[in-house]
């Protein structure tokens, strides 16, 4: 695959993968009601990270947010925290590789500044999925954790006046934000490190005839450091070196452009 | 001005089926749920079921499935209960109720009056 | 199925008198979501429809007046009529709107004395 597919399939990868960590952030539906063993209630209860909602039988829904800091558990404070960096990483990262673009002509910059901005934002973007893969499994943890003990209250009869009284337990299992937070999650650390390995491809050339002058002229030059460098006259700074980066580009140019990414 | 419709009295032989009818008007009929529910003369309130305009989607009290069969015509927005296998336990007049928020029946209709004899 | 009791069955009273009616439940009827109970009270008068006139067991449906009072949590509830006139004659009914099947009360009757 070529560089200029490899970044920008990383970018569309990536970009995917962060609106659903926003979506993901914003939906509801973090855990659901669990009906199953349930009596059917007319009611059915989800919570989100920020809201909890109610949907009654009549189609009645009521949400109500959380309006205080302190009452709430420290579990779902560091979830928020973990999907809020998540996002703000994602922006980031999104902003840099933009200009990190191949395909996106800025001003005079040359390739060296590319690959340093498109590894940036490939290691944000990891960071960002990373963030949100760890954010959505505390929370699975939480519930399930919660749901045994909701269970185990069932079934050893302590929701009740001396047995004469039964109470319905509400128990909550997975909502749909969980598996929107892991897929997306994973999308844009699959996309951080697809831009992580277009990386590579930018890192200016200057690396390889370092390598190449050293074995051509292995017997004859003796080596000594930043010999190379003088040696060549391909140092960072020459202009030589952006003529023949032009070729590279010439040869990228010619591998079929990612043009339309369709997704579901 | 809310209303819920429903027809007139019948008179059935026991084994034989009836379908009755209820047509709401003075609101959208897909936004709320039809509630059915039976009244033995002199007696207290028993719930059939109901059934959601907008997914023709029925629920049953377990007591009433298979012989109660509720559906619903968007276009004339009526809701129907169809009640088979009629015995003279059956006669009592049915009423039809729109649920609202707190899942209160908040309209109900005037009732029908069923009447099974041979 | 949730049962529900309501006590007394009749209840013989005057006008302006204050009057209490109980409904309990055999299961909570307290929703842990959005801490309301799912019960409501319907008032039938003879050869009437029931008509609705406490939802979420405390919320007055609109119209009906500030006489009728639904109170009560989880299991044990309460309509009371602070002053009974003799309109408000007719049985009362408790309705479980919580679990399926809905379920009603016998019904408390309310008589002149």
């Known amino acids: 695959m070529s560089v200029t597919a490899c970044q920008g399939l990383g970018f569309v990868v990536s970009l995917i993968g962060f609106a659903g960590i926003i979506a993901a952030t914003c939906m509801d539906q973090w855990s659901t009601q669990d009906l199953y063993n349930n009596p059917v209630t007319a009611v059915f209860n989800y919570q989100g990270l920020w809201r909890s909602c109610v949907r009654e039988s009549s189609g009645f829904t009521e949400c109500r947010g959380y309006f205080t800091l302190l009452g709430l558990p420290a579990m779902l404070q560091a979830v928020r925290a973990l999907m809020i960096v998540g996002i703000v990483l994602g922006v980031i990262g999104i902003l840099v590789s933009i200009f990190a673009l191949k395909c996106i002509r800025i001003g005079s910059m040359d390739d060296s500044a590319k690959a340093k901005m498109t590894l940036t934002s490939g290691i944000l973007f990891i960071i960002s999925g990373i963030c949100a893969i760890i954010g959505v499994s505390v929370f699975a943890n939480m519930l399930v954790t919660n749901f045994w003990m909701s269970t185990a209250n069932m079934y050893s009869g302590m929701g009740g006046m001396g047995g004469m009284v039964q109470t319905v337990q509400t128990r909550y299992t997975f909502g749909a934000a969980l598996f929107v937070g892991w897929v997306a999650g994973g999308l844009t650390l699959i996309g951080g490190v697809m831009m992580c390995i277009a990386c590579r491809g930018l890192t200016p050339d200057d690396s390889n005839f370092k390598a190449v002058s050293y074995h051509a002229s292995g017997q004859n030059v003796a080596y000594r450091p930043g010999g190379f460098k003088a040696s060549t006259g391909f140092g960072s700074n020459t202009r030589n070196k952006k003529i023949y980066d032009g070729g590279a580009r010439t040869e990228d140019d010619e591998q079929s452009h990612p043009t339309k990414y369709d997704y579901v | 001005e809310v209303q819920l419709q429903q027809s007139g009295p019948e008179l059935v032989k026991p084994g034989a089926s009836v379908k009755m009818s209820c047509k709401a008007s003075g609101y959208t009929f897909t936004n709320y749920i039809i509630h059915w529910v039976k009244q033995k003369p002199g007696q207290g309130l028993e719930w059939i079921g109901y059934?959601?305009?907008?997914?023709?989607?029925?629920k049953y009290n377990e007591k009433f499935k298979g012989r109660a069969t509720l559906t619903s015509d968007k276009s004339s927005s009526t809701a129907y209960m169809e009640f088979s296998s009629l015995t003279s336990e059956d006669s009592a007049v049915y009423y039809c109720a729109r649920l609202n928020r707190g899942n209160a029946m908040d309209y109900w209709g005037q009732g029908t009056s069923v009447t099974v004899s041979s | 199925d949730i049962v529900m009791t309501q006590s007394p069955s009749s209840l013989t009273v005057t006008v302006r008198e204050k009057v209490t009616l109980s409904c309990k439940s055999s299961?909570?009827?307290?929703?842990?979501?959005?801490?309301?109970?799912?019960l409501t009270w319907y008032q039938q008068k003879p050869g009437q429809p029931p008509k609705l006139l406490i939802y979420w067991a405390s919320t007055r449906e609109s119209g009906v007046p500030d006489r009728f009072t639904g109170s009560g949590s989880g299991t044990d509830f309460t309509l009371t009529i602070s002053s009974v006139q003799a309109e408000d004659l007719a049985v009362y009914y408790c309705?479980?709107?919580?679990?399926?099947?809905?379920?009603f009360g016998a019904g408390t009757k309310l008589e002149l004395k």
């Open positions: 299961q909570s009827l307290l929703n842990s979501g959005n801490q309301k109970n799912y």
């Open positions: 059934i959601n305009p907008y997914t023709d989607g029925p």
């Open positions: 309705q479980n709107v919580y679990i399926y099947p809905f379920t």
